[in-house]
């Protein structure tokens, strides 16, 4: 007689997550009598998946009406398909008796599940960093499958290099995770620069996922300082201007100082923003030169963002005064002033 | 009740071994048979398996590099392509009365040297 | 892929005391217990010592402790005989259907 062949005609079958899959099975001869069951995996570990006889598997139904005479399709539908449906299943035919015998196998068919990949999250470094620092950023998206997959990094459109990407597990697994870092440096022009991370998969149908970070949460431009004496007033007073120009972000602090002694605090709020994203302020400080003997020095000290403070100072000649208004004043910078 | 494999020789890169384990003494209502090979001087390696039933499973490095498959009297490991790195003794150990994975019973080992 | 690390590589202990080894794997095992444990001499093939990570195969002495569960496990000698001198190897069962092994432990007695 002609030897039982237990026939899965598809070596694979993908199927999106959430639909169902048909597992196909057919016997060659109804002879011997005894039952066909599915398992999921060949070895010791593998798992009941549907016993028509006895057991409750909800989500998996027959394609053929198994009670009928004469059946020889034993393909079956597993509805809801999720990540974890993932594996090879095996058609086997059991010789009935007590207890049934394992009599043959079919050659397996390997389920495998598209999973879309979640949303790509871009995270930034903790501290800022100033323009020629190099910044990291991290882009994770996690639950696709299968396993390929194309992350790409950009800034203001141009494809980003200095890209790390790594896809785990290694080996087989019923979902994958993609971690990926840039390494992006920094400019004083790239307060309004964005970083994309961009995730392209077979789920996605062309239509890739993206994940944005604004460099604004990630850059510290320092500001520029210059301090410098508008012409003598009619009453004996000079009008000094500290000019704070191109720095971000806008929290900054700025303290007059005559002769080494605090004169007045200042916050910067509510600035209107340069085209580039940066923010300019500017301070007076009215000094009454016939109130002074001696010259008096005028410091400028910026604190900005939590930084070391950056001071310019000035001094007003009172010695000269009122005659040689515009010669008797010099400036001397007594700070590191960043750039 | 035994295992024992056999076909192991030199064979050049490229030629198609194929090596049996035959199983002898069992009531057979259901067993597993995994092939796991060993280097010299290295560790196991475990390669595929098989049950009763002929259905076949294998590690993703050894899939389409061997083929394990069931005849009425063997279960054979073909290497369909050997490399010098396929040099090893190759052991095949039966999973038999056992429901976690493990092999109770071990052939000997059978050499298979890959040279030119 | 599903990888079992052990540790350590190697380790000498005198006659009568004790070794343990771990075997750390990078996902659960399926059931939390598919878990073996082997022992092997130079030209010989290994032989099952413990199963489903704590049951003892047959004719093993009572010297031999298996525990863990998940993704940790481990491996405890006992009493040390100049006959435990040998390779032990951990081998994990995963729902994917693998059941690769860890790297070895030689153990060596004083």
């Known amino acids: 007689e002609e030897e039982l062949q237990v026939i899965q005609p598809e070596k694979s079958v993908s199927v999106a997550a959430g639909d169902s899959a048909t597992l196909n099975c057919t016997v060659s001869s109804l002879i011997p009598v005894g039952p066909i069951q599915w398992f999921r995996g060949a070895g010791p570990g593998r798992e009941l998946i549907y016993n028509l006889k006895e057991g409750h598997f909800p989500r998996v139904t027959p394609v053929s009406d198994p009670t009928k005479r004469n059946n020889m399709d034993f393909s079956i539908r597993i509805s809801n398909i999720t990540p974890a449906d993932a594996g090879t299943y095996y058609c086997v035919k059991f010789r009935k008796g007590s207890p049934d015998v394992e009599l043959k196998s079919g050659a397996g068919t390997e389920l495998s599940v598209r999973a879309k990949p979640s949303a790509p999250v871009v995270s930034g470094p903790a501290v800022r960093a100033t323009a020629e620092h190099t910044v990291s950023f991290t882009c994770e998206s996690h639950g696709f499958s299968p396993r390929d997959i194309t992350l790409k990094w950009f800034k203001n459109g141009n494809e980003l290099s200095d890209v790390q990407t790594n896809v785990d597990p290694a080996g087989k697994s019923v979902s994958y995770s993609i971690r990926s870092t840039a390494r992006v440096v920094l400019t004083r022009r790239d307060v309004h620069s964005q970083v994309i991370c961009e995730v392209a998969h077979v789920t996605l149908q062309g239509d890739p996922l993206r994940g944005t970070a604004n460099l604004s949460e990630a850059i510290r431009v320092p500001p520029f300082l210059e301090v410098t004496q508008q012409s003598m007033r009619a009453d004996n007073q000079v009008n000094v201007t500290c000019q704070v120009t191109k720095f971000y972000p806008q929290r900054l602090q700025l303290t007059w100082l005559e002769n080494g002694n605090v004169s007045r605090t200042e916050m910067a709020s509510a600035l209107p923003e340069n085209k580039d994203g940066t923010y300019n302020w500017t301070s007076w400080l009215l000094v009454n030169v016939s109130a002074h003997r001696d010259d008096v020095k005028l410091t400028c000290q910026v604190e900005h963002d939590g930084q070391p403070a950056v001071n310019k100072s000035f001094s007003v000649k009172v010695s000269a005064h009122p005659k040689e208004q515009g010669s008797n004043t010099a400036a001397e910078n007594t700070g590191t002033n960043e750039r | 009740q035994s295992v024992e494999e056999s076909g192991g020789r030199l064979v050049t890169p490229g030629t198609p071994l194929t090596l049996a384990c035959t199983v002898s003494?069992?009531?057979?209502?259901?067993?597993?048979i995994s092939w796991v090979r060993q280097a010299p001087e290295k560790g196991l390696e475990y390669i595929g398996i098989i049950n009763i039933g002929g259905g076949a499973s294998y590690a993703s490095w050894a899939k389409g590099r061997f083929t394990i498959s069931k005849t009425s009297t063997t279960v054979d490991l073909k290497i369909t392509s050997p490399t010098p790195e396929d040099t090893a003794t190759y052991f095949c150990?039966?999973?038999?009365?056992?429901?976690?994975?493990?092999?109770?019973?071990w052939g000997p080992g059978t050499l298979v040297t890959v040279s030119l | 892929a599903q990888v079992l690390t052990q540790t350590p590589a190697s380790v000498s202990a005198a006659v009568g005391g004790t070794v343990t080894i771990s075997c750390q794997s990078s996902e659960s095992v399926y059931k939390n217990n598919f878990l073996s444990w082997y022992q092997q001499k130079p030209g010989k093939p290994p032989k099952l010592l413990i199963y489903?990570?704590?049951t003892l195969a047959s004719g093993v002495p009572s010297r031999f402790k298996g525990s863990g569960s998940g993704t940790q496990f481990t491996l405890t000698i006992s009493d040390l005989e100049s006959d435990d001198a040998a390779t032990y190897f951990c081998?994990?069962?995963?729902?994917?259907?693998?059941?690769?092994f860890g790297g070895g432990t030689e153990v060596v007695v004083k």
């Open positions: 081998q994990g069962g995963y729902r994917t259907d693998i059941y690769p």
């Open positions: 150990a039966m999973s038999y009365g056992m429901d976690t994975g493990a092999f109770n019973i």
């Open positions: 003494g069992f009531s057979l209502i259901s067993y597993y």
């Open positions: 489903g990570a704590s």
